[in-house]
């Protein structure tokens, strides 16, 4: 469940946005402009036509000095920074022969595959028709093509050895003209995946679409299977154009439900007909239950390292496995185990976090909860007891980008004491005592302060993409100097397009309530006047580990509705959200549902106090884990709310997948927590709705959160005799993309102006 | 559920012969190593012969190279240790194991066979 990234970027239409929502982003102060008289306000239009949306720029390396970039014009230039040459490698007519949307150059850079008929699935798997060019002599490579759709495919480490996944099973070639060696033979639709995750593995443990992964010099293939024969199904109409709906049926492990059995095997690829997949024992104190696979890192070509989770989140085993030649089999000693236990919540963040390893290819860096409950870095020579803590303080380091010899680069929040924002350190590990040094603190302070950070091979060079305040900005820097070479993109276009446009006051503060820090971020219209009263719109996330409270740029509908509405629209990161650490983050442990609304209700009353809110005219709107908290907020009882509206709400949480709902509420058993998962059902409130406006949203084809969710809360808002308005969108899942994505916020945007009474 | 069943120990005279075969259950030789694992009284554990895969790939240890001989029937799934010319040093419990088991609890291995070479 990660709508909150969504909800972020507003609505996504164009495909630049579409292409975003991968990273994560927000929104700035005012682009001045003195001649006032000329500013327009922002409208619907500009949101839903993206007209003021940006581009990123992540160089894709191929090696310590060369990245690959896609230009304007659909060529695929290889550009080399020492030299400052660039060529063409792929032509855009290449690529428009077999309508390529995406490409991949082999290491050995003879081969680049093309990607054609992109099909999508789930949030991050679809299939594909993929082609291979024969870069030394300008040809598709003929005979042994590949079959078609394809799941997964992907090059290995080293050289031009390709793995692909097909109807659910791993195939192995050599090189891209062989006929293919077949590895796995049990892949069958919806019931055993080789190479691929299943439904509930792609979205709540591994968030990718693949499930193999080739040793660092491409002489083994590691990769999961899943067996979910005996997962119940759930089944709902797709409408279609066809005189009877089809029935999609995706095994999906609801709340205490039977989840997939992992195994996890290695193959060697050098000989793969040899012994055959071996397969990697899971440590004990994780078999005597249902457990999970939650990652796999190779450390060296005969020394890899996985990462095992108990059924109940709060126990994760770290794994250490190497190559015994003697049996060709994996031995994963019990003195390479090493445990992570959470006694306040569950194992990590939002995942366990991985491990980067140093040099000496043993030794890692991990990022867990040190002794106050901030997550920081720590070394891992022999034990965990035994871990050196690298960062500490009251803010929490959030990604290892790099471990080079000498230098260890990651992201945090430390700087001014603002969680919503990322800066990028460096530290000194080659040297004693290690030196920290921030990056990006002071480079474009005002425009930039939530940075990511893309590292070449050995560091030599990185690029950063800041997301905002300021309109974003990619550039290039030296990786042992820091100094930036030139900008890869500063999105100019957009610069000059918001040169006339009465963009929101933003502001991002903190209120002190009860021992708890609730950051709020409040976007206000342009002639915002304090002496004045403005309708409150208050958007809410909220989930487990979430953050909507960021410094970064974003012109969305909440953009618009201040612009041109006049409304004012505050997010709060309440307890239960993340980066400040675990005491704020594990409040919410076994208890959705509870605090995350009493925080919103807080802070909307905090708001008016501050006394240009007209009480009588206040809001609340969330999609996904948000629609949940603001259809509790509307049914709390509080008067505070005249109206809101829930997207794609969960209702309850059995109706929830496993592996994200147990993580952070234990079981729906009597002898666990059924008693809570019953207290905290949205329908358990109906009678609540009575006085309020309520809008419910969702698409029929929600293969994440089903349209059951908001189908209970329907059916108990009639039973109740509570009036309601409600808008399905049919075979939409759970993002309501395309033409669904106008409709939907042309529908908000008049019941929001009906509730506040504004003309339209 | 693997399991591994040896037998064909016993005693035998210097310079003897004897055949220890290994039925297993509950996975497929072909794609395994199985071998021959032998502990003795203040020994360090020893591989003393294994046999992999399609390939039937073997690997000995330098004190039995030349005398013991393992193979390997896919049909019976069932491995052999075919050990001549007998020393006293060799006495020892065999275990049989595979790729699946060697590096497990003992609770995976079996009951071993016991060969005493003795005159």
């Known amino acids: 469940m990660k709508t909150w990234v969504k909800i972020v970027f507003g609505v996504a239409t164009s495909a630049v946005l579409a292409l975003l929502v991968m990273c994560i982003v927000l929104r700035p102060s005012r682009v001045h402009n003195s001649e006032e008289n000329t500013m327009r306000a922002l409208t619907l239009k500009d949101i839903l036509n993206g007209t003021f949306s940006y581009k990123t720029f992540f160089p894709n390396w191929i090696s310590g000095q060369e990245y690959l970039h896609q230009s304007a014009d659909n060529n695929i230039v290889l550009y080399n920074i020492e030299t400052g040459q660039s060529y063409t490698i792929l032509s855009n007519r290449t690529m428009k022969s077999v309508n390529a949307s995406n490409y991949g150059l082999s290491p050995d850079r003879q081969f680049v595959y093309l990607e054609s008929d992109y099909s999508k699935l789930w949030r991050y798997s679809y299939t594909a028709t993929y082609y291979i060019y024969d870069l030394s002599n300008g040809e598709f490579v003929r005979g042994n093509e590949l079959p078609r759709p394809i799941q997964y495919l992907c090059w290995s480490p080293v050289g031009s050895k390709l793995a692909y996944v097909y109807q659910n099973n791993i195939y192995l070639k050599q090189r891209p003209g062989d006929p293919p060696f077949q590895i796995t033979f049990n892949g069958r639709e919806n019931k055993i995946f080789n190479g691929i995750p299943d439904w509930v593995y792609e979205e709540e443990m591994l968030a990718t679409k693949y499930a193999l992964w080739w040793s660092p010099n491409g002489k083994f293939l590691a990769y999961a299977e899943f067996n979910d024969t005996d997962i119940p199904v759930i089944a709902y109409s797709y409408y279609g154009d066809e005189q009877y709906p089809r029935t999609i049926n995706i095994p999906y492990p609801k709340a205490g439900a039977k989840n997939p059995v992992v195994r996890i095997f290695i193959i060697d690829t050098t000989y793969p007909a040899y012994v055959g997949p071996q397969e990697v024992p899971v440590p004990a104190m994780i078999a005597s239950s249902d457990y999970y696979f939650s990652w796999l890192t190779w450390v060296t070509d005969e020394r890899v390292c996985l990462q095992w989770l108990k059924r109940v989140q709060n126990v994760s085993v770290l794994s250490i496995c190497d190559f015994r030649e003697d049996w060709q089999t994996w031995d994963c000693p019990k003195t390479q185990e090493h445990i992570e236990e959470s006694r306040t919540g569950w194992a990590g963040g939002f995942f366990v976090s991985t491990p980067v390893f140093s040099y000496d290819a043993i030794s890692y860096y991990k990022i867990f909860s040190d002794k106050d409950g901030y997550k920081h870095i720590h070394y891992i020579k022999d034990t965990v007891e035994n871990a050196i803590q690298i960062t500490s303080g009251k803010w929490e380091a959030i990604n290892i980008f790099r471990v080079t010899q000498d230098s260890l680069f990651y992201s945090s929040n430390e700087f001014e004491e603002y969680p919503g924002r990322r800066n990028i350190y460096r530290i000194s590990i080659g040297s004693y005592p290690p030196s920290k040094k921030c990056v990006t603190c002071h480079l474009r302070k005002e425009r930039c302060q939530y940075y990511t950070a893309s590292f070449s091979d050995y560091a030599k060079y990185y690029a950063l993409v800041c997301y905002g305040p300021g309109i974003p900005i990619s550039t290039l820097h030296d990786g042992r100097t820091d100094q930036e070479i030139k900008i890869l993109e500063e999105n100019k276009e957009l610069e000059n397009a918001l040169k006339n446009i009465q963009l929101p006051k933003e502001e991002i503060k903190k209120l002190e309530v009860d021992e708890i820090t609730l950051w709020y971020k409040m976007i206000l219209p342009p002639q915002f006047d304090r002496s004045k009263k403005y309708p409150l719109l208050i958007q809410v996330y909220g989930g487990p580990c979430s953050q909507s409270v960021r410094s970064v740029f974003a012109v969305n509908w909440i953009s618009y509705l201040a612009s041109k509405e006049g409304m004012v629209i505050a997010l709060v990161d309440g307890r239960g959200t993340a980066f400040q650490g675990d005491k704020l983050l594990y409040a919410v442990y076994r208890k959705l549902g509870v605090y995350e609304v009493e925080d919103q209700i807080t802070a909307v009353r905090k708001f008016i106090e501050m006394g240009f809110i007209d009480e009588k005219r206040i809001a609340i709107w969330g999609w996904s884990y948000g629609g949940y908290v603001s259809s509790l907020a509307l049914a709390s009882g509080t008067g505070l709310f005249k109206c809101g509206i829930a997207v794609a709400p969960v209702s309850s949480w059995e109706y929830y997948a496993s592996v994200y709902t147990e993580r952070f509420m234990g079981l729906p058993t009597k002898d666990d927590n059924l008693e809570h998962y019953k207290n905290s059902t949205v329908m358990a409130r109906a009678e609540y709705f009575r006085n309020v406006d309520y809008l419910l949203i969702h698409g029929t084809a929600d293969d994440n959160v089903h349209f059951q969710n908001s189908a209970q809360i329907a059916k108990a808002l009639v039973n109740a005799q509570v009036d309601f308005q409600a808008m399905w969108y049919s075979d939409q899942n759970h993002g309501l993309s395309g033409l669904s994505t106008n409709h939907l916020y042309t529908h908000m945007t008049h019941f929001l102006k009906q509730c506040f009474s504004l003309s339209d | 559920e693997v399991q591994l069943v040896e037998s064909g120990g016993g005693l035998v005279q210097p310079g003897g012969s004897l055949r220890l075969s290994c039925a297993a259950s509950?996975?497929?030789?072909?794609?395994?190593?199985i071998g021959w694992v032998r502990r003795a009284p203040g020994k360090e554990e020893e591989l003393v012969a294994r046999?992999?895969?399609?390939?039937?790939?073997?690997r000995y240890a330098d004190s039995v190279k030349g005398r013991f001989t393992i193979s390997a029937d896919t049909s019976k799934n069932t491995a052999y240790l075919q050990m001549n010319s007998l020393r006293a040093e060799d006495t020892a419990v065999y275990y049989c194991?595979?790729?699946?088991?060697?590096?497990?609890?003992?609770?995976?291995w079996g009951q071993g066979t016991t060969v005493t070479v003795s005159s």
């Open positions: 046999i992999c895969g399609q390939i039937g790939s073997t």
């Open positions: 509950g996975f497929n030789i072909k794609d395994t190593c």
């Open positions: 194991a595979t790729s699946y088991t060697v590096y497990r609890s003992y609770d995976y």
